[in-house]
């Protein structure tokens, strides 16, 4: 058993049929010694008396808010949550496995640049009685500070028969060093509580591996005289790290016909312009990637050919 | 070339070769099935590699003030990785494929380190840790880790030389 926050405790249980459970001793936070009784949740049934209460926690029915009273007055509360461990594997019932980029991916994170700011998000099908708390650091043995905001509901989607809820959080490394080569990963820890179930989820990554630039901006076409060719030009996204001579991007330019089946013409360039043939009803798209490290490509920025 | 008086390197040549190194490092080790190497207990293996850290002067401002600190750090790293790629970690079993980019990568690391430091002048180099994995699967894992680490290192080096070529070239 360990304290999650004031008066909230997590009981770690080996979870299998007929498991013996854990013996927990609760102590009433009071100088009083006599006449103390204990109840669970809204029930008025007295579970025991005395300054301490010993319980065998096996099931969710044994968890909840234990309250000690004296003469009708509440003295203190202890909320017990359960953390299930099946065969050495902690339960992951609250969040959905996003399966990208690999199985057992519950948290996904992205950064638009090397400033030390990043966003993480996760999915759940649970709509009520749900709270999240997020902590982060650079490294784990001698952690350096990363400040995270509160997790917020960022999207709702209907998937088949049930609704899916996306939560996200923004974090910022306190003393980021954009030009350095990271040697210690960022650690993100999410505590999730649904009713009386506690779970924790972690992700470990280097900012360089979660970089996904915003799409190029100001995408423009300039027809070339007496030719089917056009000059496409664009600019670095505003959110990308500066100076661009240091934090350089590379670009992919694609000409795509109306039909998805039509052959795509692709050009790769380090410049912010390219000359391509513009077919009727086609569109031109450009996306960006870090020039020197193969993290994610940005989404496409597109303009029609006409 | 960076010579004992601290004159400028051939920024453009270094830029071209470092960009080639980035390409080679990624072709030598694309993201193999998303193997999460941090889960594989890498403390004793890749913690000893030289990293380009915050105080090494490799940021744009530091390069403008005095690029020598940064270039020395990059040189140390190049020599370190060149030795690792020439060690039995890469020469032992399982054998690399004949057309593996590791050979080219090895040669390019040497080439860039020589561009930075001509014969007759010596910056101190970092000691190679003695890594002698016993099992072929351990050696394979170590190769992946080294190449992943090298990708990060050469990316920073390439940024340094690109910025130098654009802003510090005579």
């Amino acid at each position: 058993i360990w304290e999650l926050k004031k008066d909230v405790y997590v009981v770690e249980l080996d979870w299998y049929p007929d498991a013996p459970g854990e013996m927990v001793v609760l102590t009433c936070d009071t100088p009083e010694e006599d006449g103390i009784t204990w109840t669970l949740d809204q029930s008025s049934e007295v579970l025991g008396s005395g300054k301490t209460l010993t319980i065998q926690v096996k099931e969710f029915g044994d968890a909840g808010q234990y309250t000690c009273h004296k003469g009708g007055e509440v003295l203190s509360h202890s909320l017990l949550l359960l953390h299930k461990k099946e065969d050495g594997i902690w339960s992951t019932d609250i969040l959905k496995d996003q399966k990208e980029p690999k199985n057992k991916t519950f948290l996904r994170c992205e950064a638009k640049n090397y400033s030390g700011r990043f966003t993480c998000w996760w999915l759940t099908t649970i709509s009520t009685d749900l709270t999240f708390s997020v902590k982060s650091s650079r490294g784990s043995s001698d952690p350096q500070g990363v400040t995270c905001g509160a997790a917020t509901l960022s999207a709702e989607r209907v998937r088949g028969d049930n609704k899916e809820y996306e939560y996200s959080v923004e974090c910022q490394e306190d003393s980021a060093c954009p030009a350095a080569e990271e040697s210690l990963p960022i650690e993100v820890m999410v505590d999730a509580v649904h009713k009386l179930k506690y779970e924790n989820y972690t992700s470990s990554f280097f900012i360089r591996d979660i970089i996904k630039p915003d799409p190029p901006k100001n995408l423009q076409l300039k027809p070339l005289k007496n030719s089917r060719q056009v000059e496409v030009s664009w600019e670095y996204p505003d959110t990308w790290s500066t100076p661009h001579s240091y934090f350089s991007l590379t670009f992919c330019v694609q000409v795509q016909g109306k039909s998805k089946r039509e052959k795509k013409d692709r050009v790769f360039t380090d410049k912010t312009s390219a000359t391509v043939i513009c077919r009727k009803n086609a569109s031109i798209s450009v996306r960006a990637q870090d020039r020197y490290y193969s993290s994610s490509w940005s989404e496409w920025a597109s303009v029609p050919c006409s | 070339r960076a010579v004992p008086g601290g004159s400028s390197p051939a920024w453009t040549q270094c830029q071209q070769l470092s960009q080639k190194l980035c390409t080679l490092a990624w072709s030598a080790h694309p993201l193999v099935g998303h193997m999460d190497l941090r889960e594989e207990g890498d403390e004793e293996t890749t913690n000893d590699v030289p990293h380009i850290q915050c105080g090494d002067g490799c940021d744009p401002q530091g390069l403008r003030d005095n690029s020598q600190f940064c270039l020395q750090r990059i040189h140390q790293g190049l020599i370190f990785y060149e030795k690792l790629l020439g060690s039995d970690i890469f020469t032992g079993e399982p054998s690399l494929l004949p057309d593996s980019p590791v050979g080219q990568l090895h040669a390019s690391l040497l080439g860039l380190s020589q561009l930075l430091q001509p014969e007759g002048h010596h910056w101190e180099t970092q000691q190679i840790p003695s890594l002698s994995p016993s099992q072929p699967w351990q050696r394979l894992l170590l190769r992946f880790k080294i190449l992943r680490s090298l990708q990060a290192f050469v990316a920073v080096a390439a940024r340094v030389f690109a910025h130098g070529a654009a802003t510090l070239s005579p």
């Epitope: 049929p17 099931e59 099946e86 065969d87 | -």
Partner: antibody
Framework: EVQLLESGGGLVQPGGSLRLSCAAS????????MGWVRQAPGKGLEWVSY????????GYADSVKGRFTISRDNSKNTLYLQMNSLRAEDTAVYYC?????????WGQGTLVTVSS | DIQMTQSPGTLSLSPGERATLSCRAS???????LAWYQQKPGQAPRLLIY???SRATGIPDRFSGSGSGTDFTLTISRLEPEDFAVYYC?????????FGQGTKVEIK
């Protein structure tokens, strides 16, 4: 007392399908992960598949991926294994077991024979 | 996948003797996630040990497990007549979970 009772085994032709069931009693079925383990005649054990308590997380052995589907009906206290595109090498006794990775409690097994 | 190799294939011993069964993994088994099972002819297997050394409910203390990394051992301190069976080890530290081929403990 934990009890697991498999059913649905039998003789099936290669390429055919079969659905195994496992009726659970003596414990709160909906709260625990479950799995299927098989044993070819005279051979060792192979973990086939597992499913979390809610059914949200599943896992399969490479040898059955894409052909077998594990599911559960918590209201009926029953675990299922839908086996499609059966092959001769799927011939085995199929055991239902509690647990996501460690089989603490086992059923008595049901024999699946794939033969033409 | 992690391959599990058990040795010996067969162990011929007399009741009252000590049995030592070995299980070796092709790669390190994380967090000592290793289990041992006993199977008698015509019966389902029975869990003996999990987490390399923790005895399952109702398992007599003559059964003990030890080891970590790639080498694990099941020891039966004094063989009882009912202990003659096939024993399997299983790793569950890395998916897919894999079993050893088994060690048969037979009466000498």
């Amino acid at each position: 007392e934990v009890q697991l009772l498999e059913s649905g085994g039998g003789l099936v032709q290669p390429g055919g399908s079969l659905r195994l069931s496992c009726a659970a009693s003596g414990f709160t079925f909906s709260r625990y992960s479950m799995g299927w383990v098989r044993q070819a005649p005279g051979k060792g054990l192979e973990w086939v598949s597992y499913i979390s308590s809610s059914g949200g997380v599943t896992g399969y052995a490479d040898s059955v991926k894409g052909r077998f589907t594990i599911s559960r009906d918590n209201s009926k206290n029953t675990l299922y294994l839908q086996m499609n595109s059966l092959r001769a090498e799927d011939t085995a006794v199929y055991y239902c077991a509690t647990g996501i990775a460690v089989a603490r409690y086992w059923g008595q097994g049901t024999l699946v024979t794939v033969s033409s | 996948d992690i391959q599990m190799t058990q040795s010996p294939g067969t162990l011929s011993l007399s009741p009252g003797e000590r049995a030592t069964l070995s299980c070796r993994a092709s790669q390190s088994v994380s967090s000592s996630y290793l289990a041992w099972y006993q199977q008698k002819p015509g019966q389902a297997p029975r869990l003996l040990i999990y987490g390399a050394s923790s005895r399952a409910t109702g398992i007599p203390d003559r059964f003990s497990g030890s080891g970590s990394g790639t080498d694990f051992t099941l020891t039966i301190s004094r063989l009882e007549p009912e202990d003659f069976a096939v024993y399997y080890c299983q790793q569950y530290g890395s998916s897919p979970w894999t079993f050893g081929q088994g060690t048969k403990v037979e009466i000498k």
